[in-house]
C-alpha cells in the first residue's frame, strides 16, 4: 500500500492522543534505555510503511502484536486516514484470524515495541517531510 | 561486530540474471536493523538498489524496482539480490550493508559484477 | 529526486592542512545527510551521519555542518589515512535516496 495520500495530521492525532499512550502501557516497567533502535524512516509515508510492517508482521521470538491495543488503534487510524488502506488489508486480515495466537508479552515484543515507539516519534517530528 | 561478505558470478551475459549472496556474521539479521544493496559503475558513484528490514518490509530504488528482488535466508543469516535483464550499464562493484532503514553504517567489501556476453 | 552536488571534485592539499568539502542538495534534505569515506579497493565507510553526528569510532578531526540544502564536511588537520574519495548521501526522500558524485581528496 502507498501511505502518500493519508491525512497525516489526522493520524498524528491519533497518535498523540490514544496510540502514544497505549505503546508506553505495554512498555511499562521497561526503562527508555534498555533497547537500541535500530531501524528508522525517512519521510511521512515511509515511517507508515515500516509502522504498518512491524506492527503486523509476525517476526523471530515475536509471533503477534496485531491484537494488542496500540495495534488495533493503528489500523482503524490507517482505515479512516489512509484512502483504500482498508481494501488492502482484507486477505491480510484473514490470514492472520487463521493464525491468531495467545498473547505472550515475551522480551523480544517489548524491543519490537520500542522500535515502533522510534518510528512514531520519527514520524511525529514536525520537520518530516510529508513525501 | 558484524562482518558482511557478497558472492557470486563475477560475469554475467546481457539479458540474464544478476545473483548476488551477503553473508552476515556477528548479527542476526532477523534481530535488527535493514540489510541493503548498494552498486558502484567502475570510476562512478554510488546507487542505493534497496533493503529489507529485519520484520520483513522491503523498499526497492524506485529506477531498478521492476527488474529488483532482495530476499532472505534467516537459517544462514545471509541475504540475496537478483536483477534481472542486465545489460552493461549494470556492470558494477556490487557491495552488502547494514542500515537504519536511512544510511549505511556497515559494508562489504564489495563484488565485482561484468555485464558482457 | 533530489540531486546531490559535490564540490570541489578534487581537492588538493598537505598533510596537516585544513579540508572543506562542500555537498548542495537541489531541494531541502534538513539534517538527513550523511557523509562516508572511500579509499581505492575498499567499501564507503559511514562518518558523519544527521548533518553533524559523528559515527561510531570517527576521530574528531571530522565535522559536518549544515541543514536544508547546503553542506560542509571538515576535516581539521589531514592525516595521511585521510586521502581518500568522500561521499555525501540525502536520506530525505525515500524511497529515492541519493548519493553524491564524490570529492577527491589528494595530496598535493
Known amino acids: 500500500y502507498d501511505f502518500t495520500n493519508c491525512d497525516f495530521e489526522k493520524i498524528k492525532a491519533a497518535y498523540l492522543s490514544t496510540i502514544s499512550k497505549d505503546l508506553i502501557t505495554y512498555m511499562s516497567g521497561t526503562k527508555s534505555t534498555e533497547f537500541n533502535n535500530t531501524v528508522s524512516c525517512s519521510n511521512r509515508p515511509h515511517c507508515l510503511t515500516e509502522i504498518q510492517s512491524l506492527t503486523f508482521n509476525p517476526t523471530a521470538g515475536c509471533a503477534s502484536l496485531a491484537k494488542e491495543m496500540f495495534a488495533m488503534k493503528t489500523k482503524a487510524a490507517l482505515a479512516i486516514w489512509c484512502p483504500g488502506y482498508s481494501e488492502t488489508q482484507i486477505n491480510a486480515t484473514q490470514a492472520m484470524k487463521k493464525r491468531r495466537k495467545r498473547k505472550v508479552t515475551t522480551n523480544k515484543c517489548l524491543e519490537q515495541v520500542s522500535q515502533l515507539q522510534g518510528l512514531w516519534r520519527r514520524f511525529n517530528r514536525p520537520l518530516l517531510k510529508q513525501q | 561486530q558484524v562482518q558482511l561478505q557478497e558472492s557470486g558470478p563475477g560475469l554475467v551475459k546481457p539479458s540474464e540474471t544478476l545473483s548476488l549472496t551477503c553473508a552476515v556474521s556477528g548479527y542476526s539479521i532477523s534481530s535488527g536493523y535493514g540489510w541493503s544493496w548498494i552498486r558502484q559503475p567502475p570510476g562512478k558513484g554510488l546507487e542505493w538498489i534497496g533493503y529489507?528490514?529485519?520484520?520483513?518490509?522491503?523498499s526497492y530504488n524506485p529506477s531498478l524496482k521492476s527488474r529488483v528482488t532482495i530476499s532472505r535466508d534467516t537459517s544462514k543469516n545471509q541475504f540475496s539480490l537478483k536483477l534481472s535483464s542486465v545489460t552493461a550499464a549494470d556492470t558494477a562493484v556490487y557491495y552488502c550493508?547494514?542500515?537504519?532503514?536511512?544510511?549505511?553504517?556497515?559494508w562489504g567489501q564489495g563484488t565485482l559484477v561484468t555485464v558482457s556476453s | 529526486e533530489i540531486v546531490m552536488t559535490q564540490s570541489p571534485a578534487t581537492l588538493s592539499l598537505s598533510p596537516g592542512e585544513r579540508a572543506t568539502l562542500s555537498c548542495r542538495a537541489s531541494q531541502s534534505v534538513s539534517s538527513n545527510l550523511a557523509w562516508y569515506q572511500q579509499k581505492p579497493g575498499q567499501a564507503p565507510r559511514l562518518l558523519i551521519y544527521d548533518a553533524s553526528s559523528r559515527a561510531t569510532g570517527i576521530p574528531a578531526r571530522f565535522s559536518g555542518s549544515g541543514s536544508g540544502t547546503d553542506f560542509t564536511l571538515t576535516i581539521s588537520s589531514l592525516e595521511p589515512e585521510d586521502f581518500a574519495v568522500y561521499y555525501c548521501?540525502?536520506?530525505?526522500?525515500?524511497?529515492?535516496?541519493?548519493f553524491g558524485q564524490g570529492t577527491k581528496v589528494e595530496i598535493k
Open positions: 550493508a547494514r542500515t537504519n532503514l536511512l544510511y549505511f553504517d556497515s
Open positions: 529489507f528490514s529485519y520484520y520483513g518490509s522491503t
Open positions: 548521501q540525502q536520506y530525505s526522500n525515500w524511497p529515492q535516496y541519493s
